[in-house]
């Protein structure tokens, strides 16, 4: 399992992971105590047939070519959590691991 | 976690799981001994903002709106394996659980 890594200077048109820092402060999300920003990354690019396909299923659907199937798209295939400190709806401070906050790898699915 | 289920008569335009039977025999994939066909399903439909979003990350990327991020797409969010009997490249018969062969749920990511 592997995926491409790109940056803002890359000329890669295929599905790739790009750096992105999410800034909660800039969003006005004041209920998040920490972190105020974190490296989230995101996926972007084209999914040509077979390139970076995560699942055999993606290839099979392409073969079967059913009505309305749009072909694979560039999406996170591996994600990881981050620890966060935040206020919940009852104004209690919660410290917890929030799943799927960071994109570690991108692929076509 | 939930996802929509549709069929060929559905008028649903949003991200939905549709039935699809994959027929290995029709593909000429004769190295697969069994099953000769199975119910794979596939995802299709539109991903309006927030609808069926699997990860908070998807929402955050939409907020941050980086260059080239195409918005979420309708993709498998839950998959399951099937048991298969097949020949490997060394012409040995292998019996094993092949992951991510069936789409159980679709969502926007």
């Amino acid at each position: 399992d592997f995926g491409l890594d790109c940056d803002e200077h890359s000329t890669e048109s295929r599905c790739c992971r790009y750096p992105l820092t999410v800034d909660f402060e800039a969003f006005g999300w004041d209920w998040i105590i920490a972190p105020k920003r974190y490296k989230a990354n995101y996926c972007s690019g084209e999914c040509e047939f077979v390139f970076l396909q995560k699942y055999p299923h993606t290839h099979l659907v392409h073969q079967a070519n059913p009505r309305g199937s749009a072909g694979p798209c560039c999406t996170p295939t591996k994600m990881s959590p981050i620890n966060m400190l935040y206020f919940n709806g009852k104004e209690q401070i919660i410290y917890g691991k929030i799943p799927a906050m960071v994109v570690d790898r991108c692929g076509c699915s | 976690d939930f996802g929509l289920d549709c069929d060929e008569h559905s008028t649903e335009s949003r991200c939905c799981r549709y039935p699809l039977t994959v027929d290995f025999e029709a593909f000429g994939w004769d190295w697969i001994i069994a099953p000769k066909r199975y119910k794979a399903n596939y995802c299709s439909g539109e991903c309006e903002f927030v609808f069926l979003q699997k990860y908070p990350h998807t929402h955050l990327v939409h907020q941050a709106n980086p260059r080239g991020s195409a918005g979420p797409c309708c993709t498998p969010t839950k998959m399951s394996p099937i048991n298969m009997l097949y020949f490997n490249g060394k012409e040995q018969i292998i019996y094993g659980k092949i992951p991510a062969m069936v789409v159980d749920r679709c969502g926007c990511s």
Partner: antibody, heavy 124, light 107 residues
Amino acid sequence: QVQLVQSGAEVKKPGASVKVSCKASGYSFTGYFMHWVRQAPGQGLEWMGNIYPYNGVSNYNQRFKARVTMTTDTSTSTAYMELRSLRSDDTAVYYCARRYYYGTGPADWYFDNWGQGTLVTVSS
Amino acid sequence: DIQMTQSPSSLSASVGDRVTITCKASQDINSYLSWFQQKPGKAPKSLIYRANRLVDGVPSKFSGSGSGTDYTLTISSLQPEDFATYYCLQSDEFPLTFGQGTKLEIK
């Protein structure tokens, strides 16, 4: 529908070879194991071996291994069973049979279709 | 090799009777047992697979049961067309082995 049509009866001398054919129709020939089973006059059934036409991988009963060869011609969807060094006790009806998988386990199958049989008589 | 012992080797019965044929394996065959019917001059015909599953198109008067080493074929109400020879087959391991057959005759 699935059909297995075998070649006609043969009379052979001891020490000779015989090649029995089994022509398949009504299904994708390359994707199903073909087995060979024989039956001596008034006797029971005896498994000889099988072949997978897609890649020619075969599995023989040890009892026949030195004398039998199973082959296929995918262009004509035909399976062949050749038995060499014939003896009088090889006089039998030889059947081909298709193995059909109802599940995915290695033994999740049964014989769903049989050829009509080919009588091979070995006599001096 | 796994030995399959079928009994009885022959059986006389009347139309309408219920008959049972047994097959004993020399070791556990994990229910990988099939039953066949064979009429004179004809190829065998599959009746039952995986010990108790009926092949499509086979009448429900045929039933199979058993596990481990002991298996039975039951014909609930004999009709004239059921008089034939019946064989069991184990497919749990190679080489495949058949029982020696049970000849079912009209009394």
